[in-house]
């Protein structure tokens, strides 16, 4: 097992025996799971690929970065990691593509250090409200979390249960105002087709906000004007159509924000005028001149920067006597 | 209540393969997990693999490792046991069960099938 004079790159590994043999009492300092990797010098254990089914009970004191990815977890009970002497230095956990579709409350209870959770890459079907506040109360303890990334977190279609997917992470996420701290929120790849119009104003101290790759078609009902730290967002790769004036306002209005916009299927109407005359004069859209029209087909691969409003004509609606069939 | 149907047992030689079968009746969406557990003439009944409905995720008992697979198909509520290198000590009952927990013990499983033989011999 590792010493404390151990250099950070040099990884110690357990024998397989340790791990059942001492369970049951408090971690040795210098011990390592089975299955896993440690450093005492970097604070690092890494259990990564071994299909480890629970997370392991003899995880180090010391261990402030813990990688348990690749595993077959399938569920976080509650107080997953809850020891006793507590992992006070618990600082970056990352469960990415460990098979988790179960997240139950009070799973990251008793980790008062832990600032970034990653949970992407798995099916996680059935995520509790209170599996990041850990409690039901309507005011929970602030949790420590800074960085949550939650990107691919959506099960395949047919293993989804009958509910909101949206409304199921979006009361994670706000349940008992515990991550008012938050500052990086990545929610790509989700098939998101709206987001609900309470989550971003919850989330004051939000920098970073990533919504890319998902199926968001409008924001006409998401305000930004309660971000003021926003520094990017994220919106690359959605089925955005156009982006209305309250929306241009509120996102004019943040004093630090980047937006990312591309490769979405924006229509170029008469609708599209506010925003085209507004990218013009903005520079908080990144890579501006890439966006291009989607529809109609008369407009498709038209740069948006390079539109006036005479491009940009409705169809006259014909009163119903003059329709033909 | 979910019915559970194993099929697919019979005698094979050491060294030989079998794939048993489990069909669900319904999908049980209250049941997040399907197990084979096994039963040899006069001991109890010992858990062999677990598969997870959603995700996918799996997981043995030591002694099968390596040796065999579980797998589900969504589309047609069905768990199936993939078993090679058979032995002897392989032979016993097979039992289907589902049930809530992402557990080892006999106790995690609510509903059981009836069991299908496999038998190892020369």
């Known amino acids: 097992s590792s010493s404390p004079t151990s250099s950070a790159s040099s990884f110690s590994s357990s024998a397989p025996f340790l791990a059942s043999a001492v369970s049951a009492q408090p971690p040795l300092p210098d011990q390592c799971p089975a299955l896993c990797e440690c450093s005492e010098a970097a604070r690092t254990v890494k259990c990564v690929n071994r299909n480890l089914t629970e997370v392991p009970t003899d995880l180090p004191a010391y261990v402030r970065n813990l990688f348990l990815t690749g595993n077959q977890l399938a569920v976080l009970p509650a107080g997953a990691f809850a020891r006793r002497p507590p992992l006070a230095e618990l600082a970056a956990l990352n469960l990415s593509g460990s098979r988790l579709d179960e997240v139950r409350a009070g799973a990251f209870e008793h980790l008062p250090s832990l600032r970034q959770l990653d949970l992407s890459h798995n099916p996680l079907a059935d995520l509790s409200p209170f599996a990041f506040s850990g409690s039901n109360a309507s005011v929970s303890a602030p949790s420590p979390l800074v960085e949550l990334i939650l990107n691919h977190i959506v099960p395949p279609e047919d293993e989804r249960q009958n509910r909101s997917f949206e409304g199921m992470v979006v009361a994670a996420l706000l349940a008992g105002r515990a991550l008012q701290g938050l500052r990086r929120l990545e929610l790509a790849s989700n098939h998101f087709l709206y987001l609900p119009r309470d989550v971003l104003a919850q989330l004051p101290s939000l920098r970073h906000l990533d919504l890319s790759n998902n199926s968001l078609v409008s924001l006409t009902y998401v305000s930004f004007r309660n971000l003021t730290h926003l520094e990017s967002l994220h919106l690359e790769d959605n089925a955005l159509k156009v982006l209305h004036n309250g929306t241009l306002a509120e996102l004019q209005g943040l004093p630090h924000i980047r937006v990312f916009l591309d490769n979405n299927p924006w229509v170029c109407d008469c609708h599209m005028a506010d925003m085209v005359t507004w990218l013009k004069e903005t520079e908080v859209v990144q890579g501006k001149d890439r966006l291009t029209c989607a529809y109609p087909e008369k407009m498709r691969n038209r740069v948006l920067l390079e539109l006036n409003s005479a491009d940009l004509d409705c169809d006259p609606i014909l009163p119903p006597s003059l329709q033909t069939s | 209540e979910v019915q559970l149907v194993e099929s697919g047992g019979g005698e094979v030689q050491p060294g030989g393969s079998l794939r048993l079968s489990c069909a669900a009746s319904?999908?049980?969406?209250?049941?997040?997990?399907m197990a084979w557990f096994r039963q040899a003439p006069g001991k109890e009944r010992e858990f062999v693999a677990a598969?997870?409905?959603?995700?996918?995720?799996?997981r043995y008992t030591e002694s099968v490792k390596g040796r065999f697979t579980i797998s589900r198909d969504n589309a047609k509520n069905t768990v199936y046991l993939q078993m090679s290198s058979l032995r002897a000590e392989d032979t016993a009952v097979y039992y289907c069960?589902?049930?809530?927990?992402?557990?080892?013990?006999?106790?995690?499983?609510?509903?059981w099938g009836q069991g299908t033989l496999v038998t190892v011999k020369p």
């Open positions: 069960a589902a049930g809530q927990a992402w557990g080892t013990k006999f106790t995690d499983y609510s509903d």
């Open positions: 319904r999908r049980p969406f209250s049941s997040k997990t």
């Open positions: 598969v997870r409905w959603i995700g996918g995720a799996t």
